[in-house]
């Protein structure tokens, strides 16, 4: 259902700078369905429309992400934009999917790797060990070298995450696996949160 993601992005890109700022502030206080996590304030406030769309989809999946975006837009008085999203929602059948999903069954949605992107960039220090675990199976030689060429751990992790959008679930699970081996306490800490 990539249409929902595109619709969210279109709506957010139609907001002015001040409106986007207001959208983020409302997102911090909007009533969430039981079991859903809130996007951390620090990360949220720095995001552009593309990053915010990705974060909405990784945290809430497309169906609920779309619904949440509509709620916030309506709350801001942007009825027209919200109605455009409503149309997308009805066309894609997201309304049926969202209504039939109990909150607990989708709580904490989004893959661990996507959900904790910022924290992993900030807190993974043994990047070379992670790279070695992914070399060949997930990362090509060129990608491996490109990440290693970066100087700081944070830059290496940023570079590594630049490849993630093209990964399938198996690749993301491989990264998660490497992190569990090399940074077990970090993974436990993030999973707990």
């Amino acid at each position: 259902m990539g249409r929902a993601r595109d619709a969210i992005l279109d709506a957010l890109e139609n907001l002015s700078g001040d409106e986007l700022k207001k959208f983020k502030m409302k997102l911090l206080t909007v009533q969430l369905r039981e079991g859903y996590g809130r996007i951390p304030r620090g990360a949220l406030l720095q995001m552009d429309a593309i990053d915010l769309t990705d974060k909405l989809v990784s945290y809430y999946l497309e169906s609920y992400g779309l619904e949440l975006t509509m709620t916030v837009l309506r709350d801001m008085g942007l009825q027209e934009l919200a109605e455009q999203l409503q149309t997308t929602k009805e066309e894609s059948g997201a309304v049926a999917a969202a209504a039939s999903v109990p909150a607990q069954s989708t709580a904490r949605t989004g893959h661990f790797v996507d959900q904790h992107r910022q924290a992993l960039i900030a807190r993974v220090t043994e990047v070379d060990g992670v790279l070695d675990a992914l070399h060949g199976s997930v990362l090509t030689e060129g990608q491996y070298q490109a990440v290693r060429a970066e100087t700081t751990s944070q830059d290496k992790m940023r570079k590594l995450f630049s490849f993630v959008p093209s990964w399938n679930l198996t690749c993301k699970d491989s990264l998660l696996q490497a992190l569990k081996e090399i940074h077990p306490y970090l993974v436990m800490d993030l999973e707990q949160s």
Epitope: M1, L61, S63, A97, S100, V101, P102, S105, T106, A107, R108, T109, G110, H111, F112, V113, D114, Q115, N168, L169, T170, C171, K172, D173, L176, Q177, K180, E181, P184, V187, M188, L190, E191
Partner: antibody
């Protein structure tokens, strides 16, 4: 609510093959992985592998590579497991299961199909 | 592959007793250990996840503890409906593996 409905019991001759289905409802099929487990009488559970209908990616237990093939049909929200070259060792109850959360580091199963009994006998 | 050794393989106890089942991993699995209950002819049911977290709707007489390679499932004040086989499962790495099971019977 979340439900995983498996196909009925199968009786297959040695050397034959079988396709077991797991139809899901109550959530968006492409949002979660489906895992498959094998349980022989009076024995424990074995993890066969998983499929993520969102992108079609699969992961297999080395022990079941060549024996099991996992597929998913988005249009019918159904996951399938095809077992080939069947022997009496393949006689078991097969379960499909869904982790409670997608992409969690924990890999724990909160939702299970009712099980499909496979009997391989001539 | 990570081997999960469960003991005892069978256990007989009286109603009201407190019983303990142990699970030993062949390597460090941190807290990535889950417990399931399977009643005869039924499906496995999640009891405990991440070593010590009680799953939704599971009675508080069930508890889990441990980390690293040693884990325990404790059932206090044993009830008739607790007759079942209990399995541990590691979620540290693929392939996911289960213990051999502990069959609990009432004396």
């Amino acid at each position: 609510q979340v439900q995983l409905q498996q196909s009925d019991a199968e009786l297959v001759k040695p050397g034959g093959s079988v396709k077991i289905s797991c139809k899901v409802s109550g959530y968006t099929f492409t949002d979660h992985t489906i895992h498959w487990m094998k349980q022989r009488p009076e024995q424990g559970l074995e993890w066969i592998g998983n499929i993520y209908p969102g992108d079609g990616s699969t992961m297999y237990n080395e022990k079941f590579k060549g024996k099991a093939t996992l597929t998913a049909d988005k249009s019918s929200s159904t996951a399938y497991m095809h077992l080939n070259s069947l022997t009496s060792e393949d006689s078991a109850v097969y379960f499909c299961a869904r982790p409670y959360y997608f992409g969690s580091a924990s890999y724990y199963f909160g939702y299970w199909g009712q099980g499909t009994t496979l009997t391989v006998s001539s | 592959d990570i081997q999960m050794n469960q003991s005892p393989s069978s256990l007989s106890a009286s109603l009201g007793d407190t019983i303990t089942i142990t699970c030993h991993a062949s390597q460090n699995i941190n807290v990535w250990l889950n417990w399931y209950q399977q009643k005869p002819g039924n499906i496995p049911k999640l009891l405990i996840y991440k070593a010590s977290n009680l799953h939704t709707g599971v009675p508080s007489r069930f508890s889990g503890s441990g980390s690293g390679i040693g884990f325990t499932l404790t059932i206090s004040s044993l009830q008739p409906e607790d007759i079942a086989t209990y399995y541990c499962q590691q979620g540290q790495s693929y392939p996911l593996t289960f213990g051999g099971g502990t069959k609990l019977e009432i004396k």
